[in-house]
Interface confidence: low
Amino acid sequence: DFTPTAPLASYPQPWLGAHPAAVVTPGINVTLTCRAPQSAWRFALFKSGLVTPLLLRDVSVELAEFFLEEVTPAQGGSYHCRYRKTDWGPGVWSQPSNVLELLVTDQLPRPSLVALPGPVVAPGANVSLRCAGRIPGMSFALYRVGVATPLQYIDSVQPWADFLLIGTHTPGTYCCYYHTPSAPYVLSQRSQPLVISFEGSGSLDYTQGN
């Protein structure tokens, strides 16, 4: 079991990013870029939990690109990278980079949609709807059933988005989606519909089928 010996202060961690995105549909070509804070000689890419070997790139600059062609769902997972310099001695690598979660899927998991403080509100009161997925950095859209275009659209750094509904037009049935913020777009399943009603008005069910 070989453990890297690089102290944190000496060999700072590199940064690992994905292009065009870390969430993609199958068949897309993905480039993982490992960027070192200093010029490096060799970069290595690792995937957690697989016996597959590391990917190596010999370069003499600050970054290395690892090409994953026509990715499959199996190539999704947790990746990290390290770098080394020729004068570090055998087996001495940098600290690991940030962990990059690559998700390869045709459809993102269904978000939840909940009302805060609850789905029954006083007439004229505002209500906040939280659409929550599991992946940060997505674009969220809130729909009212029967209306074709989104009511609201939020780019969120969190794995959720809070939509504020103002006053008298609140009652109705709502659902939400989320998707990757840039192409190639990957869309989530639709949330379960959520009925919002005024106190004392009964639960008007505006729900329509899928």
């Epitope: 079991d1 070989f2 060799r42 690792f46 697989l50 016996v51 597959t52 070997p53 990917l55 087996g91």
Partner: antibody, heavy 117, light 109 residues
């Protein structure tokens, strides 16, 4: 020139132990995933164990507990410690270097292990 | 018994095209890469194809690999007498490397 040279094979009695070595030359040993593959007489190839650059070694189910893979990066050498040997462990043992994206691109010539009383 | 299934034997005459199949499952071939090896009698295996369809330098373009779903195949065109050997497919799952049982290729005539 890239070369792998296995050694340590030979005749051993059932229940005995043996340590195989694989000396590598021609590239940076510490940068690669190394593995042992065996081939019983007249049979196919069977993966035994692998040693990644970072993290724990991994083993085929049949060998977990009996065999131990290790590496000495300063000596450019891979090892396989084999304990509680059985007649069915008789095989040629190859060491191989793993390439990208999951193949064995360089093989040694193999060393024969015979387990017999 | 191997997790990856190959026919035990195949044959062809010089100049012919021969295909060797390798069948697995979604946990190995279906979601991972396939490699092919040639083993001449009394020698170590030699890498023929990696990453489903790539040839290492020095391997003639008579050898080609492909993958579809949970199966892969090795094609040898313009068969020659020196192609007589054992051929193995190889893939992996989340915890181990896997080999097919091997196919003995005989070049007739």
């Amino acid at each position: 020139e890239v070369q792998l040279l296995e050694s340590g094979g030979g005749l051993v009695q059932p229940g005995g132990s043996l340590r195989l070595s694989c000396a590598a030359s021609g590239f940076t040993f510490s940068d690669y995933y190394w593995t042992w593959v065996r081939q019983a007489p007249g049979k196919g190839l069977e993966w035994v164990s692998g040693s990644p650059v970072f993290g724990a070694a991994n083993y085929a189910q049949n060998f977990q507990g009996r065999f131990t893979i290790s590496r000495d990066n300063s000596k450019n050498t891979l090892y396989l410690q084999m304990n509680s040997l059985r007649a069915e462990d008789t095989a040629v043992y190859y060491c191989a270097k793993a390439g990208i994206p999951g193949h064995f691109d360089i093989w040694g010539q193999g060393t024969l292990v015979t387990v017999s009383s | 018994q191997s997790v990856l299934t190959q026919p035990p034997s195949a044959s062809g005459t010089p100049g012919q095209r021969v295909t060797i199949s390798c069948s697995g499952s979604s946990s190995n071939i279906g979601n991972n890469y396939v490699s092919w090896y040639q083993q001449l009698p009394g020698t170590a295996p030699k890498l023929l194809i990696y990453g489903n369809s790539n040839r290492p330098s020095g391997v003639p373009n008579r050898f080609s690999g492909s993958k579809s779903g949970t199966s892969a195949s090795l094609a040898i065109s313009g068969l020659r007498s020196e192609d007589e050997a054992d051929y193995y497919c190889q893939s992996y799952d989340s915890s181990s490397w896997l080999f097919g049982g091997g196919t003995k290729l005989t070049v007739l005539g």
